[in-house]
């Protein structure tokens, strides 16, 4: 009763198509699969960035897999062949592991890469990224930004740089068609006559860095003798009402400060007959139904009411 053995996949490699972190892992079937022609061979693939404590694990019948990685760090991957128990009249058989690594050999000391990279997707319409030059780099150093997301044929360079003292310190992106809810990859590299400059890689999803416009058309309505309804409208733009959370700051008679977070465009406030003045401001943020994260908008213009008759909606700026 000979022990059934199977070889690991051949030609296992990590291929970089130039998409700034979106890599292809590919391999060929193992040698000597003739004995298992009736069998569907599977592969167990494990991969991670160097330094990560956990492996991502995939079981597939394909000869390739694609995923995003942090190119600031190395990548390691391993794969073995799996013969299901149906093929072996018993338990599952596994080959030894085939292993490979990938790393973009760096140029330059880490301090030379851009510092404080910050990207904001304004009102879900305009992406703007800004950065500071690396530490100790001279004024002749210039940085260039490249980006890619699924749907682009190849990585594109920024065409509208923000400059300070002749250096690129940011990028205004063009309209980015069908670019949300997928990984958006950025590389900022640099050049200098004086010293090599370290490249820096970033990955995020655009819907998670949205900064909306502030709410507009703030109004008051007297609901009853002791209730006032505060209302506002969503800002102009592509973000639907269902995607907003709001934070309200209410000041009564310059003393009491109430803050509240709500999910729709109204808030009912309990007041006393003694209330002489009421002011409120609102700001908005994309909520958990539409993104995993977001940035609060600026506060709206302040709206105030002074006097007795709220029903007339006397609004004072």
């Amino acid at each position: 009763d000979t022990e059934i053995k199977v070889n690991p996949p051949q030609d296992f490699e990590i291929v970089d198509p130039g998409y700034l972190g979106y890599l292809y892992l590919q391999w060929q079937p193992p040698l000597s699969l003739d004995h298992f022609k009736e069998c569907t061979v599977e592969y167990e693939l494990k991969y991670r960035n160097i330094g990560s404590e956990t492996w991502k694990t995939i079981i597939t019948k394909n000869l390739h897999y694609k995923d995003g990685f942090d190119l600031n760090k190395g990548i390691e991957a391993k794969i073995h062949t799996l013969l299901p128990w149906q093929c072996t009249n018993g338990s599952e058989v596994q080959s030894s592991w085939a292993e490979t690594t990938y790393w973009i050999s760096p140029q330059g000391i880490p301090e030379t890469k851009v510092q404080d990279m910050d990207c904001v997707y304004y009102n879900w319409q305009y992406l703007l990224c800004s950065w500071k030059p690396g530490i100790g780099v001279l004024l002749d150093t210039n940085y260039n930004l490249f980006y890619w997301y699924e749907g682009l044929d190849h990585a594109l360079q920024c065409v509208d740089y923000i400059k300070a003292d002749g250096q690129n310190i940011g990028c205004r992106f063009p309209y980015l068609e069908a670019s949300d809810y997928k990984d958006f990859y950025i590389c900022v590299n640099g050049s200098s006559e004086n010293k090599p400059i370290r490249s820096s890689y970033f990955t995020f999803q655009l819907q998670n860095i949205v900064k909306p416009l502030p709410p507009v058309y703030l109004t008051f309505t007297r609901e009853s003798s002791c209730e006032i309804k505060l209302k506002w409208s969503i800002p102009l733009g592509p973000i639907p009402a269902r995607c907003f959370d709001y934070e309200i700051e209410i000041r009564e008679d310059d003393t009491t400060l109430v803050t509240a977070t709500v999910e729709n465009e109204t808030y009912t406030l309990k007041t006393t007959n003694e209330t002489r003045q009421l002011c409120f401001v609102v700001r908005s943020k994309v909520n958990i139904y539409c993104s995993d994260d977001g940035i609060w908008s600026e506060w709206s213009d302040k709206q105030c009411w002074e006097g007795e008759d709220l029903s007339k909606k006397t609004l004072l700026r």
Partner: antibody
């Protein structure tokens, strides 16, 4: 397997220069940077400079005026030259491979004595 | 430049004892760029722990590393004879790259 082998003189006279060759095997110089580090009883481990896979260099500012690092990718050799040596340059000089921003393999070291 | 101060300079430990040594940086270092090397007399340094907490190939699991910012440490959960050596911390964050003066670990 990965190896870095150093060759160079053991004794140099003051004001003369030091030349060390680091011959590598098991990897390509087009894919990895090579650093130079020295070790002396008085100053411990000191980083001197690096030649990156693309051929550009970075030097410790304290040595930039008298240090030169170059390489020949086809011969898998890295060349280290330091001028104007003094007694306090007496040390063991190492080449080391850069991987994942650390020095994962080191040469065996070249022991230098600067003395007349 | 970033100065790395290691303490203690010399320490001794018995077999099976837990050992901890520290490395303090004069300014903040990214944990990705803080490494530890082991060196024995007459040999070149060996990469021991990289990026604060990752063990280099062949390093026993009794070793661990931790820390962030300006404070880092290397720990041996149970001292063995072969662990007697000098351990250096190293920052790869800023030029010039620098090393600590080392902690010499002796077997008691």
């Amino acid at each position: 397997q990965v190896q870095l082998k150093q060759s160079g003189p053991g004794l140099v006279q003051p004001s003369q220069s030091l030349s060390i060759t680091c011959t590598v095997s098991g990897f390509s110089l087009t894919s990895y940077g090579v650093h130079w580090v020295r070790q002396s009883p008085g100053k411990g481990l000191e980083w001197l400079g690096v030649i990156w896979s693309g051929g550009s260099t970075d030097y410790n500012a304290a040595f930039i005026s008298r240090l030169s690092i170059s390489k020949d990718n086809s011969k898998s050799q890295v060349f280290f030259k330091m001028n104007s040596l003094q007694a306090n340059d007496t040390a063991i000089y190492y080449c080391a491979r850069d991987r994942y921003d650390a020095f994962d393999y080191w040469g065996q070291g070249t022991t230098l004595t600067v003395s007349s | 430049q970033i100065v790395l101060t290691q303490s203690p300079a010399i320490m001794s430990a018995s077999l099976g004892e837990r050992v901890t040594m520290t490395c303090t940086a004069s300014s903040s270092v990214s944990s990705s760029y803080l490494h530890w090397y082991q060196q024995k007399p007459g040999s070149s340094p060996k990469l021991w722990i990289y990026s604060t907490s990752n063990l280099a190939s062949g390093v026993p699991a009794r070793f661990s590393g931790s820390g962030s910012g300006t404070s880092y440490s290397l720990t041996i959960s149970s001292m063995e004879a072969e662990d007697a050596a000098t351990y250096y911390c190293h920052q790869y964050h800023r030029s010039p790259l620098t090393f600590g003066a080392g902690t010499k670990l002796e077997l008691k």
